[in-house]
């Protein structure tokens, strides 16, 4: 039960995280005009990975895409790449993890296959989260480096976009969304990897084990086997008693701290 909960929670956390990474990547507010000392200009500038926007004091907002690829700074291209890789890996991870979920039955899928898929999706989520965190951090570092600007903004040469006033840019909302989302995806991935350990069948050197417990006997055989205990497929060849998960070798012992996932 703990394994299923861990896996399900890992999936949900990763799903939220990846949705956040997608949202951050699409957001326009990666960098926003610094208004620390009252507004100096009657326009508010903010920039994303794909376009820059200007909001006038009337509320009128105008956004312009960066209609150039070669003219963009390498750092911005790197951030775009990291975020896209993060999204792609996360999306694939979500797809894989759906089929790996213990609560979903697809044909006669082996428990070992589900365990492998859970681990694969977990690793994908971890890498996805790291990509997002790295991308956001690179952009944040770029902002800090460019904080005190004189006449050109951080995208000098971006399709001829030269800022001719002293505009300072600070962290936009997208950075915080990206950091949190990346962290959630990372946590979700770790949870999936932990759940994988609980799903993987134990390797044994013997064919079968017979034992007596609670007045009835159950014969366990390695592999995809449904025990007649009412629990459905028992993917770790375990029987659950009073919340304590015990392997064949531990049937007569009390639950130890290692028994809980």
């Amino acid at each position: 039960m703990a394994v299923t909960a861990c896996q399900g929670l890992g999936f949900v956390v990763s799903l939220i995280g990846i949705a956040g990474i997608i949202a951050a990547t699409c957001m326009d507010q990666w960098s926003t005009q610094d208004l620390y000392n009252n507004p100096v200009t009657a326009v508010f500038n903010y920039q994303g990975l794909w376009r820059s926007c200007v909001r006038e004091s009337s509320g009128f907002t105008e956004c312009r895409g960066y209609f150039t690829l070669l003219g963009l700074p390498a750092m911005l291209q790197a951030v775009r790449a990291l975020m896209i890789v993060g999204i792609v890996l996360g999306a694939i991870g979500l797809l894989v993890s759906i089929f790996a979920l213990k609560c979903i039955r697809i044909g006669s899928m082996e428990d070992s296959a589900k365990a492998n898929m859970t681990l694969t999706s977990g690793i994908m989520f971890i890498v996805s989260g790291l990509c997002a965190i790295a991308g956001v951090s690179v952009f944040a570092n770029m902002l800090v480096t460019n904080f005190w600007m004189s006449t050109a903004n951080m995208y000098t040469g971006m399709g001829g976009m030269v800022q001719t006033v002293q505009t300072r840019y600070t962290f936009g909302a997208a950075l915080f969304v990206g950091w949190v989302a990346g962290g959630l995806t990372l946590i979700g991935g770790v949870m999936m990897c932990i759940a994988c350990r609980g799903l993987a069948p134990e390797e044994t050197n013997y064919k079968a084990v017979s034992y007596h417990a609670s007045g009835h006997s159950v014969a366990y055989k390695p592999g995809g086997f449904k025990a007649s205990t009412g629990f459905g497929s028992n993917t770790k060849n375990k029987k659950i008693y009073d919340g304590g998960a015990r392997t064949e070798d531990e049937v007569q012992s009390y639950p130890s701290k290692h028994d809980y996932v």
Epitope: T41, S57, S58, F60, R64, G160, V165
Partner: antibody
Framework: EVQLQQSGPELVKPGTSVKMSCKAS????????MHWVKLSHGKSLEWIGY????????IYNQRFKGKATLTVNKSSRTAYMDLRSLTSEDSAVYYC????????????WGQGNSVTVSS | DIVMTQSPSSLTVTPGERVTMSCKSS????????????LTWYQQKPGQPPKLLIY???TRESGVPDRFAGSGSGTDFTLTISRVQAEDLSFYYC?????????FGSGTKLDLR
């Protein structure tokens, strides 16, 4: 039709205060900022500041901070400017002007309110 | 504060003539984010409030005759009236609509011969 109707001319004594009004009609009052501009005799236009009628937020020209106070009454669709501690330097025509949607420009102006400070 | 310098202070022209007036700002009014110049031109006839002619340095306000044209970028701007008419007898003001506080030029007075 957009109209900004300003209150009548004022003849006031030095050291006193005056509160002028600007009643808006023909548009959604809370959707547009209201600016105030001073035109002194023989001088150019001077921007005093503006108020956002939706939230009451103001931005002033530092030169007029402490001299002018901008307020609005949303229900009566009226903007007000309070001028205090008046001197002969404050004798001028004061305009209210609606901020247009583009370019931070002022697209509609009131007819002006003449203020004369004299003892 | 941004200083707006208009020249000449007055112009005497004959109807049908082409006229240009200049406006210079002490700082660039070009915003890099949208590549727009935040300079506005107003016309003020005697005894009347100012009237918006041009915003974003070159965009004509609706209802303004096409003989009025604004140009320039950064710090140097020009208002051109291609064929002056009698009703154009006015003061023309340029305004910085980028930096707070908004500032106006001293104006150019257009007189007809």
């Amino acid at each position: 039709e957009v109209q900004l109707q300003q209150s009548g001319p004022e003849l006031v004594k030095p050291g006193t205060s005056v509160k002028m009004s600007c009643k808006a009609s023909g548009y959604t009052f809370t959707d547009y900022n209201m600016h105030w501009v001073k035109l002194s005799h023989g001088k150019s236009l001077e921007w005093i500041g503006y108020i956002n009628p939706n939230n009451g937020g103001t931005i002033y020209n530092q030169r007029f901070k402490g001299k002018a106070t901008l307020t609005v009454n949303k229900s009566s669709r009226t903007a007000y400017m309070d001028l205090r501690s008046l001197t002969s330097e404050d004798s001028a025509v004061y305009y209210c002007a609606r901020q247009g949607y583009y370019g931070n420009s002022m697209d509609y102006w009131g007819q002006g309110n003449s203020v004369t400070v004299s003892s | 504060d941004i200083v707006m310098t208009q020249s000449p202070s007055s112009l005497t022209v004959t109807p049908g003539e082409r006229v240009t007036m200049s406006c210079k700002s002490s700082q660039s009014l070009l915003n890099g984010g949208n590549q727009r110049n935040y300079l506005t031109w107003y016309q003020q006839k005697p005894g009347q409030p100012p009237k918006l002619l041009i915003y974003w340095a070159s965009t004509r306000e609706s209802g303004v005759p096409d003989r009025f044209a604004g140009s320039g970028s950064g710090t140097d701007f020009t208002l051109t009236i291609s064929r002056v008419q009698a009703e154009d007898l006015s003061f023309y003001y340029c305004q910085n609509s980028y930096f707070y506080p908004f500032t106006f030029g001293s104006g150019t007075k257009l007189d007809l011969r």
